[in-house]
Interface confidence: low
């Protein structure tokens, strides 16, 4: 190899050992039969050398540094060449360094040709191994602006007082151009300005100078974003730290098109703006730090640019001003689909404060919009408390548990609407009456509607789930002893069409001691499957539930139990079942922990089934499934 450097080139070449490897065989640079491990070539020198091994790229690296002095004379602006040409250099990992010194009053602009640059953070690397490291100067201190790969959005970086630019090329990379040019500009009066240009949808992750170390004290750094008119941009902070300020406050400032309050000032811990149309600037301003305990200011953030959904241009009004004790949350649901660029999916309050989830509370009107490629990625959960504090006022009062129509106007699927129904302890109970009779969901007869009601105790210490119920069955009402939550859960988008089938009325009624009473009027056409609350986990200890089963005059009901025995083992007390004819009051009592369950039996009149649990032994719980079928009477037994 021969390297010759012209006298006026201001270029020095250094070949030195790279990161030590565990290669057994050493390798040397051979210059006129002399073996060495380092070679420095200065301007005006011409040196002939070779290597003592076949793969010098495993041992050595080459650094080519060009010093450009803009202090004493004119600056060589324009496209930067790779000198010496890469074809003249040995195939080693090579780093070209350009060190530009300039006056504080002169701005220097690095312009990057397409493909532009993409900043990467600590622990990351570039797929093709080509990296740009860019540093600036504040007086004598070097400040790292960032490390970059190809294929990004960064098109220009403006600095003043000087630039140090390093281009690292792996030994196998054929590249022979620098990919950037230098231009002079007027003073920028800040550390640097980074311009990021988006041609279409995409995202860019950017970092404050010196990241992950601290941003220089009391400095200002600006990012300018160029966004196509038809797209929207959102900013989210991925990581930040605040230093200990003695004077002034660390902040970010936005210049946003169309804003009447430019610059818009945000704290780093604030939710950052989203859904922005057009170009905008973001600046990071440091403070005067406490000399004793400065801490560090650092920021890593992402700008996400994507197509607005039709819905993004719409403002939806969610009027909760007449609601009480209600909260509505729009949030992402976990999704299977994945691809390289996953657009963000945001919900925006007042079109500007965008986040992946949003909770709206009662008492106000809220204006929301969406910035999301596919609104099925979001769903909505609503919670509403209906409580009674004064039993004299509430008794016999009724409330309709109906999803407000406002919610159907939103372009997001409703997942859960939960009503928490709270009553004064030992004073009142509750009765749920559905608009359409309900079916209890069982393995034997699952619900196939687009929604169900999940009824569970809302007493923290009580683990009691009454079951899942959907329209189209035989349950006319459900009475419960104390606080419960009723959750309308949707299973299909067709819920909007079936919404008319929803509707429960809750009434506060005089207190009773049983955990639950189900009123059932079987249908002549099908089996009614019923099961005890807390299926699979067992009816809670010492809990009692009843079913009031109506038998029409012209029918006979057949009551059948799923198993021969319950399998319950009582630690204390007894578990029993009472079947009582309502007309004659005749009753039969079965010991559930001892007796076999009754064989299928016929009832000509309405009857009660009451089940009371003992304190069961662990793993020997009480779970009971039974069904009722109606058949026409053949003989009138009245």
């Amino acid at each position: 190899f021969e390297i010759a450097l012209p006298r006026e080139s201001n270029i020095t070449v250094l070949i030195k050992l790279g990161t030590p490897t565990l290669l057994a065989k050493p390798c040397y640079i051979v210059i006129s039969k002399r073996h060495t491990t380092m070679l420095s070539i200065k301007p005006g020198e011409r040196i002939l050398f070779t290597f003592s091994c076949q793969s010098p790229e495993n041992h050595f690296v080459i650094e080519i540094q060009k010093n450009i002095d803009c202090m004493s004379g004119p600056c060589p602006f324009g496209e930067v060449q790779l000198q010496p040409s890469t074809s003249l250099l040995p195939t080693l990992n090579r780093t070209f360094i350009w060190d530009v010194k300039a006056h504080k009053s002169i701005g220097l602009e690095l312009q990057f040709s397409i493909p532009r640059l993409r900043q990467f953070g600590p622990g990351e690397s570039c797929p093709d191994g080509v990296t740009y490291s860019i540093s600036g100067r504040i007086d004598a201190t070097v400040v790292r602006i960032g490390t970059f790969c190809s294929n990004g959005t960064v098109s220009r970086i403006k600095m003043q007082e000087g630039v140090k630019m390093a281009l690292h090329l792996p030994w196998f990379h054929p590249r022979n151009v620098s990919g950037f040019s230098i231009a002079n500009r007027s003073s920028i009066k800040r550390l640097c300005i980074i311009e990021s240009v988006f041609e279409g949808e995409g995202s860019a992750t950017l970092m404050s100078a010196n990241y992950p170390e601290g941003f220089p004290e009391d400095e200002l750094m600006t990012w300018q974003f160029v966004i196509p008119a038809h797209l929207r941009a959102s900013v989210s902070f991925l990581n930040f730290n605040l230093s200990n300020c003695e004077r002034k406050e660390e902040r970010v400032e936005y210049y946003i098109p169309g804003s009447t309050t430019n610059p818009e000032v945000f704290k780093l811990e604030d939710k950052q703006p989203g859904n922005m149309a057009g170009n905008f600037n973001l600046s990071l301003q440091g403070c005067d730090q406490d000399a004793q305990n400065p801490g560090i200011l650092r920021l890593q953030f992402q700008v996400l640019v994507q197509h607005p959904q039709n819905e993004s241009n719409k403002i939806y009004v969610v009027d909760l001003s007449n609601e009480r004790a209600t909260s509505l949350t729009i949030e992402p649901r976990p999704v299977k689909q994945s691809r390289k660029f996953v657009p963000g999916c945001f919900v925006c309050l007042e079109s500007r404060t965008c986040s992946t989830n949003l909770t709206l509370t009662s008492g106000s009107k809220h204006k929301i919009s969406f910035l999301c490629d596919n609104l099925t990625r979001l769903w909505m959960n609503v919670e509403k408390n209906i409580s009674c504090t004064d039993h004299r006022y509430c008794q016999r009062k009724s409330y309709s548990l109906q999803v407000p129509s406002d919610i159907f106007h939103l372009p997001v699927e409703l997942h859960d609407f939960s009503w928490k129904l709270l009553v004064p302890k030992d004073r009142l109970s509750l009765v749920l009456v559905p608009a359409q009779k309900l079916q209890q969901h069982t393995h034997e007869k699952p619900c196939n509607t687009s929604f169900s009601y999940l009824v569970a105790s809302a007493i923290p210490s009580q683990d009691l789930y009454f079951g899942s119920f959907c329209p189209g069955g035989s349950i006319e009402q459900i009475q419960v002893k104390q606080n419960i939550s009723v959750t309308l859960r949707t299973f299909a988008p067709s819920f909007r069409q079936e919404a008319s089938r929803q509707g429960l009325t809750v009434s506060f009624i005089p207190y009773f001691k049983e955990e639950g009473v189900f009123t059932v009027t079987p249908d002549t056409k099908s089996k009614v499957y019923l099961r005890t609350p807390n299926w699979d986990r067992g009816l809670p200890s010492l809990t009692s539930v009843s079913w009031n089963i109506s038998v029409p005059r012209d029918q006979v009901a057949c009551l059948t139990f799923f198993k021969e025995r319950t399998g319950v083992v009582c630690q204390t007390g007894r578990a029993f079942m009472i079947i009582q004819e309502q007309r004659t009051r005749a009753e039969e009592i079965f010991s559930l922990d001892e007796d076999a369950l009754p064989k299928p039996r016929f009832h000509h009149h309405s009857f009660w089934v009451n089940i009371s649990n003992c304190s069961p032994a662990s793993g020997k719980q009480l779970d009971l499934l039974f069904w009722v079928t109606l058949t026409p009477r053949t003989v009138d037994l009245t």
Partner: antibody, heavy 119, light 107 residues
Framework: QVQLVQSGSELKKPGASVKVSCKAS????????MHWVRQAPGQGLEWMGW????????TYADDFKGRFVLSLDTSVSTAYLQISSLKAEDTAVYYC????????????WGQGTLVTVSS | EIVLTQSPATLSLSPGERATLSCRAS??????LHWYQQKSGQSPRLLIK???QSISGIPARFSGSGSGSDFTLTISSVEPEDFAVYYC?????????FGQGTKLEIK
């Protein structure tokens, strides 16, 4: 009932390739995503990636990009994991598991396929 | 990626005792955490989904709690067949990750 049945154990030499199959029955393959999990001898579980059974698009965890290929043949309700340029450190039990759309937990698992790489 | 740290690595208990297994996430993952049991020579089995939701067919003695970054799997009274390795799994974002496992062994 739902079943995921995987192909039998494989003994391979370094540098060779192996293709593990996972046949789904008792449900429609394209209704659920298929995930692959690796467990090296005496070690924990590592999620390798998943395949979108509707589109056939695979997604890989970073450590499994390159030599690992996930594919499908919906006509025989079977998912495949192919590993090329096998190394000794690929010795492990490979599990397929069924994931749920909008609900990424693995409710059914194959019995596992032991792949041993040894010269 | 989300790193899940399980503790303790090994838990030695006698049948009938209460087992408490912990799983901590490196960042908040809401309730996107699932628990699996793996017995020697067998495939993992889903025990709890979404931090606390029970799974049909799993005994009631298994319960889960927690949200954010701290999660707990509780076995109210350990049965002989419960001695196994238990893994937590994050389903918050790709890549899905598993904890390193907690081995529940007989004392």
């Amino acid at each position: 009932q739902v079943q995921l049945v995987q192909s039998g154990s494989e003994l391979k030499k370094p540098g060779a390739s192996v293709k593990v199959s996972c046949k789904a029955s008792g449900y429609t393959l394209t209704d659920f995503s298929m995930h692959w999990v690796r467990q090296a001898p005496g070690q924990g579980l590592e999620w390798m990636g998943w395949i979108n059974t509707e589109t056939g698009a695979p997604t890989y965890a970073d450590d499994f990009k390159g030599r690992f290929v996930l594919s499908l043949d919906t006509s025989v309700s079977t998912a495949y994991l192919q590993i090329s340029s096998l190394k000794a450190e690929d010795t492990a039990v490979y599990y397929c598991s069924r994931g749920r759309d909008y609900d990424p937990h693995f409710d059914y698992w194959g019995q596992g396929t032991l792949v041993t790489v040894s010269s | 990626e989300i790193v899940l740290t399980q503790s303790p690595a090994t838990l030695s208990l006698s049948p009938g005792e209460r087992a408490t297994l912990s799983c901590r996430a490196s960042q908040s993952i809401s309730d996107f955490l699932h628990w699996y049991q793996q017995k020697s020579g067998q495939s993992p089995r889903l025990l709890i989904k979404y931090a606390s939701q029970s799974i049909s067919g799993i005994p009631a003695r298994f319960s889960g709690s927690g949200s954010g970054s701290d999660f707990t799997l509780t076995i109210s009274s350990v049965e002989p067949e419960d001695f196994a390795v238990y893994y937590c799994q994050s389903a918050h974002s790709f890549p899905y990750t598993f904890g390193q496992g907690t081995k529940l062994e007989i004392k």
